[in-house]
C-alpha cells in the first residue's frame, strides 16, 4: 500500500515495522538518531520499492548494510529534496555497505554520502546509471578506498560476475556488495529499464518490471500511475499528485492540512493537485479548488490586532512577509540593526497599502524609505492627532524618502508632518507633497524648514564625468573639477561604485546608517595642481561586468541661506571588458565504442564574455603498466583494514618523497604551495560541508511533543 | 501508542441510523486527524471521511455525502460517526483510524494507528 506522507523513524529501531505494508512511500524516509546497537537482521521489507522524495540515514547505530533492509528499493523519485540531495548517507558509524542492489533509478536531485567511517563498496557503484549528473555528488570522508580492499563477486576465484563500466578513466566491475552486482541493462534497450532477465521493460517503466513490454507490470512509472498502468499523462478528469500518481477530483477534494479549516483544502490546478495556488495565482473565491491568475502581485491582507503594528526589528518586520495590504497602522521606529535596509526591504517590500496612518520615528537606522518599495497608497482611514496620516519624526539619518522618479505613491486622507530629521532636504519633502497629492493640506508648521536638512548638502550641483576607459579588470574614470564659491571648503571626492547587472540602481540601495552598504567606497584627494581634473583607478574589478559609478563632493558644512551646497554626480554605468572565461567544470569522458569516446562537460563558472565556442583537444595515450604490476586478487594485497575515522580524507603519502631536481640541485621536493584559488576552494568546501550539517541538524532535530 | 476502540456497529433496517464512537488512548498528543474507512466481503478497504483534531475540518467520500456526519469530543477523546439514511451497499466492517500526519490524504496508508473494526449490516 501507499504510506506517507513521509515517515520518520526515529529513536526506536522497532518503529520500522510501520514500513510492514509498504510499497511505495509517498514522501520521505528518515530513520536516524537510533544510538543503541540492534540486530536488524529479523527486520525485511521487500515489498517497498519506490520513495518519492528523499532517503535520509543519520546515526544509526549497528546497522550494516540497507540491502537487507530494503532488498526491492529500485526507485528514489526525489520530487522533493533534502538539500538538493535525494539520497543522504550521513555518520552512519557501522554502515559497511549501501547494498540497495535493486536501486536503479533516482529520478532527481544528487546523493550525499559523507562522515560514514566504515563505509565501503563506494568507488565499485556507478552512481552514472542511476543518476542523470554525477557532478553533484557529494562523497566524502567515508572510509579510503585502499583500506577497503572492495571485491565484487568472483573477482577472487578469477570468474568475475559483474559488468564493467569506466568511471573517470577506470575500467571495473560494478557491484554493491561482496555478493550482489550493479544490475545493467543491455545497450538495446537504451534508456529503458529491463527485466531480471534482460528483456527489455514498456518505455513507461521505470527502473524494472516483471515482464517485457507490458505498462501494468512495472516496478515503478516513469511518468505517472492510474489504476494499475503507467501513463505518460493523467487520463481527463484525474490529476496528477506527489509527482508520480493521478487521483480523481473527489480524491483531491478529501485531501486536508492538519491545522487547514474548512476553506483551505487542496486545490486543482494545471492538472495538478496541490496544496496550495503557486505563485502568482490566487484561489476563485473562499471555498473554490481552482485558481486564477493575480493580477499583480498576489493580494495578502494581514491585520494587527491591536490596529498599530510597531517596526523596531528585523524580528517584527518579518511578520509582515509576503502581504500587500496591511489593515491598520504602521509605526516603524529601528534604531538600530545590522544589514537592516535590505532586510526590511525583504519583508515589506511588497507593502502596497496601508489602510491607516505611516510614523516613522526615531528611525537613526534609517537613510532611505526605499525599502517599502512597492507602497502606493496611504489610506488615513485612521490618523494620528491633528489629522496626520504620514508623521516623520527625529531620523537623525534619513536623507532620501523614495526616488520621485520611479514612484507613484498617495495619500488619500490627512496631512504630512516633518520634523527633526537634519539630513532630510525640504525639497524631497516638497516633491513628495506633489507626487502623493497631498500639496495644500499642511500647515506652516506640518514641514519645518530650519530642523529638516539642516546637515545635509541639500542645493546639489552635478559633478560631470570627463573621461571613462575599461579592461578586463580596471575602470578609469576622470570628472570635472568641482569649484565651490569658496574653493577651501572642497576637502575631497568619494568615489562609489558596486555591480550592476541591470541599470535600475539608486544612491540609497542597501544603506543603513548602521554601517551597512551595498556600494564600495573609495576616497579621492585633490590633484595638487589646479588645472588637473580628479580621477581614479577602479581595480580587482570582474571581467565582462557592469558596474554602477557615481561621485561625491565632500565640503565643508560652508552654510548658505540656512543650507549647504554639495556636488554629485549621475549614476553612471560600465561595463568591463571581456576576458579569459574560468576552466569548463565536470569533464566527463566515457568510451561508447572502440572508436568513439563521449566527453561532456558543463560551462565554466566565469565565463568572463559572451561563449562562442568550445575548443576540445586529445591525444592518444600510452597504456599504464603500473595496472599490471601487481595481481590484486592475492589475498596479501589487499591492504589492512583500518577504522577511518569519519573525517574528511587527506591521501597519505606511503613512499618515500619522490627525488626530483629542485631548483637546480638534486633533492627530495616538496609539495607546492597551495595557490590562492586552492586555498579559496578549501575554504568554500569545509564552508559548504558546514551549511550542510547545520541544515540537517536544523531540519531533525526537533522538540519532543508535550 | 495510539488505542483505537470502536462500538456501536449493528443490524439494522435500510433507511435507518446508527452511530459509530471511537475513543483513543495513549499518546493521544500524537495525532493530527481521525478517520473512519470502511471494508465490505471481497473488496479494498475505503475511505468514508475524516477529522481534524485541531480545528474539527471535515472531509468526506462522495458516497456518503449529506447522509453521515463526522464530529469529535476533545474531552472524551473520541470520534463518532453518524450515519442516516443507511442503504444495503454500506454494509461492511467500520474501521476507526488515526494519524500523526501534517498532510492527511483519503489514502489508507496515511494512517499509522487502527481499530479492531465494528460491524455494521443493513438489511433491505
Known amino acids: 500500500e501507499i504510506c506517507g506522507p513521509g515517515i520518520d523513524i526515529r529513536n526506536d529501531y522497532q518503529q520500522l515495522k510501520r514500513l510492514e505494508n509498504c510499497t511505495v512511500i509517498e514522501g520521505y524516509l528518515h530513520i536516524l538518531l537510533i544510538s543503541k546497537a540492534e540486530d536488524y537482521r529479523s527486520y525485511r521489507f521487500p515489498k517497498l520499492t519506490v520513495i518519492t522524495e528523499y532517503l535520509l540515514l543519520f546515526r544509526v547505530a549497528g546497522l550494516e548494510s540497507l540491502g537487507d533492509l530494503f532488498p526491492n528499493l529500485t526507485v528514489i523519485r526525489g520530487w522533493k529534496l533534502f538539500y538538493n540531495y535525494a539520497l543522504v548517507i550521513f555518520e552512519m558509524t557501522n554502515l559497511k555497505d549501501i547494498g540497495l542492489y535493486n536501486l536503479r533509478n533516482i529520478t532527481r536531485g544528487a546523493i550525499r554520502i559523507e562522515k560514514n567511517a566504515d563505509l565501503c563498496y563506494l568507488s565499485t557503484v556507478d552512481w552514472s546509471l542511476i543518476l542523470d549528473a554525477v557532478s553533484n555528488n557529494y562523497i566524502v570522508g567515508n572510509k579510503p578506498p585502499k583500506e577497503c580492499g572492495d571485491l565484487c563477486p568472483g573477482t577472487m576465484e578469477e570468474k568475475p560476475m559483474c559488468e564493467k563500466t569506466t568511471i573517470n578513466n577506470e575500467y571495473n566491475y560494478r557491484c554493491w556488495t561482496t555478493n550482489r552486482c550493479q544490475k545493467m541493462c543491455p545497450s538495446t534497450c537504451g534508456k529503458r529499464a529491463c527485466t531480471e532477465n534482460n528483456e527489455c521493460c514498456h518505455p513507461e517503466c521505470l527502473g524494472s518490471c516483471s515482464a517485457p513490454d507490458n505498462d501494468t507490470a512495472c516496478v515503478a512509472c516513469r511518468h505517472y500511475y492510474y489504476a494499475g498502468v503507467c501513463v505518460p499523462a493523467c487520463p481527463p478528469n484525474t490529476y496528477r499528485f506527489e509527482g508520480w500518481r493521478c487521483v480523481d477530483r473527489d480524491f483531491c477534494a478529501n485531501i486536508l492540512s492538519a491545522e487547514s479549516s474548512d476553506s483551505e483544502g487542496f486545490v486543482i490546478h494545471d492538472g495538478e493537485c496541490m496544496q496550495e495556488c503557486p505563485s502568482g495565482f490566487i484561489r476563485n473565491g473562499s471555498q473554490s479548488m481552482y485558481c486564477i491568475p493575480c493580477e499583480g502581485p498576489c493580494p495578502k491582507v494581514c491585520e494587527e490586532e491591536k490596529k498599530t503594528k510597531t517596526i523596531d526589528s528585523v524580528t517584527s518586520a518579518q511578520m509582515l512577509q509576503g502581504c500587500t495590504i496591511f489593515k491598520g497602522n504602521l509605526l516603524i521606529n529601528i534604531r538600530r540593526g545590522n544589514n537592516i535596509a535590505s532586510e526590511l526591504e525583504n519583508f515589506m517590500g511588497l507593502i502596497e497599502v496601508v489602510t491607516g496612518y505611516v510614523k516613522i520615528r526615531h528611525s537613526h537606522a534609517l537613510v532611505s524609505l526605499s525599502f517599502l518599495k512597492n507602497l502606493r497608497l496611504i489610506l488615513g482611514e485612521e490618523q494620528l492627532e491633528g489629522n496626520y496620516s504620514f508623521y516623520v519624526l527625529d531620523n537623525q539619518n534619513l536623507q532620501q524618502l523614495w526616488d520621485w522618479d520611479h514612484r507613484n505613491l498617495t495619500i488619500k486622507a490627512g496631512k504630512m508632518y516633518f520634523a527633526f530629521n537634519p539630513k532630510l532636504c525640504v525639497s524631497e519633502i516638497y516633491r513628495m507633497e506633489e507626487v502623493t497629492g497631498t500639496k495644500g493640506r499642511q500647515s506652516k508648521g506640518d514641514i519645518n524648514t530650519r530642523n529638516n536638512g539642516e546637515r545635509a548638502s541639500c542645493e546639489s550641483d552635478v559633478l560631470h564625468f570627463t573621461s571613462t576607459t575599461t579592461s578586463k579588470n580596471r575602470i578609469i574614470i576622470t570628472w570635472h573639477r568641482y569649484r565651490p564659491p569658496d574653493y577651501r571648503d572642497l576637502i575631497s571626492f568619494t568615489v562609489y561604485y558596486k555591480e550592476a547587472p541591470f541599470k535600475n540602481v539608486t544612491e540609497y540601495d542597501g544603506q543603513d546608517a548602521c554601517g551597512s552598504n551595498s556600494w564600495n567606497m573609495v576616497d579621492v584627494d585633490l590633484p595638487p595642481n589646479k588645472d588637473v581634473e580628479p580621477g581614479i583607478l577602479l581595480h580587482g574589478l570582474k571581467p565582462w561586468t557592469q558596474y554602477a559609478v557615481y561621485v561625491k563632493a565632500v565640503t565643508l558644512t560652508m552654510v548658505e541661506n540656512d543650507h549647504i551646497r554639495g556636488a554629485k554626480s549621475e549614476i553612471l554605468y560600465i561595463r568591463t571588458n571581456a576576458s579569459v572565461p574560468s576552466i569548463p567544470l565536470d569533464v566527463l569522458s566515457a568510451s561508447n565504442s572502440s572508436s568513439q569516446l563521449i566527453v561532456k562537460w558543463n560551462p565554466p563558472s566565469l565565463p568572463n564574455g559572451n561563449l562562442s565556442y568550445y575548443i576540445v583537444r586529445w591525444q592518444r595515450q600510452p597504456q599504464d603498466g603500473y595496472l599490471y604490476r601487481h595481481n590484486y586478487c592475492s589475498k596479501d594485497k589487499i591492504p589492512i583494514r583500518k577504522y577511518a575515522d569519519g573525517t574528511i580524507d587527506i591521501e597519505e603519502v606511503t613512499e618515500n618523497p619522490k627525488t626530483e631536481v629542485c631548483g637546480g640541485e638534486k633533492g627530495p621536493c616538496c609539495a607546492c604551495p597551495k595557490t590562492e584559488a586552492e586555498k579559496q576552494a578549501e575554504k568554500e568546501e569545509a564552508e559548504y560541508r558546514k551549511v550542510f550539517e547545520n541544515f540537517l541538524h536544523n531540519s531533525i532535530f526537533v522538540p519532543r511533543p508535550e | 501508542q495510539v488505542k483505537l476502540e470502536e462500538s456501536g456497529g449493528g443490524l439494522v433496517q435500510a433507511g435507518g441510523s446508527l452511530r459509530l464512537s471511537c475513543v483513543a488512548s495513549g499518546r493521544t498528543f500524537s495525532r493530527t486527524a481521525m478517520a473512519w474507512f470502511r471494508q465490505a466481503p471481497g473488496k479494498e478497504r475505503e475511505f468514508v471521511a475524516t477529522?481534524?483534531?485541531?480545528?474539527?475540518?471535515?472531509r468526506y467520500a462522495d458516497s456518503v455525502k449529506g447522509r453521515f456526519f463526522i464530529s469529535k469530543d476533545s474531552a472524551k477523546n473520541t470520534i463518532y460517526l453518524e450515519m442516516n439514511s443507511l442503504e444495503p451497499e454500506d454494509t461492511a466492517v467500520y474501521y476507526c483510524?488515526?494519524?500523526?500526519?501534517?498532510?492527511?490524504?483519503?489514502?489508507?496508508?496515511?494512517?499509522?494507528?487502527w481499530g479492531q473494526g465494528t460491524q455494521v449490516t443493513v438489511s433491505s
Open positions: 483510524a488515526a494519524t500523526a500526519a501534517a498532510v492527511i490524504t483519503p489514502t489508507r496508508g496515511y494512517y499509522n494507528y
Open positions: 477529522i481534524t483534531w485541531n480545528s474539527g475540518t471535515t
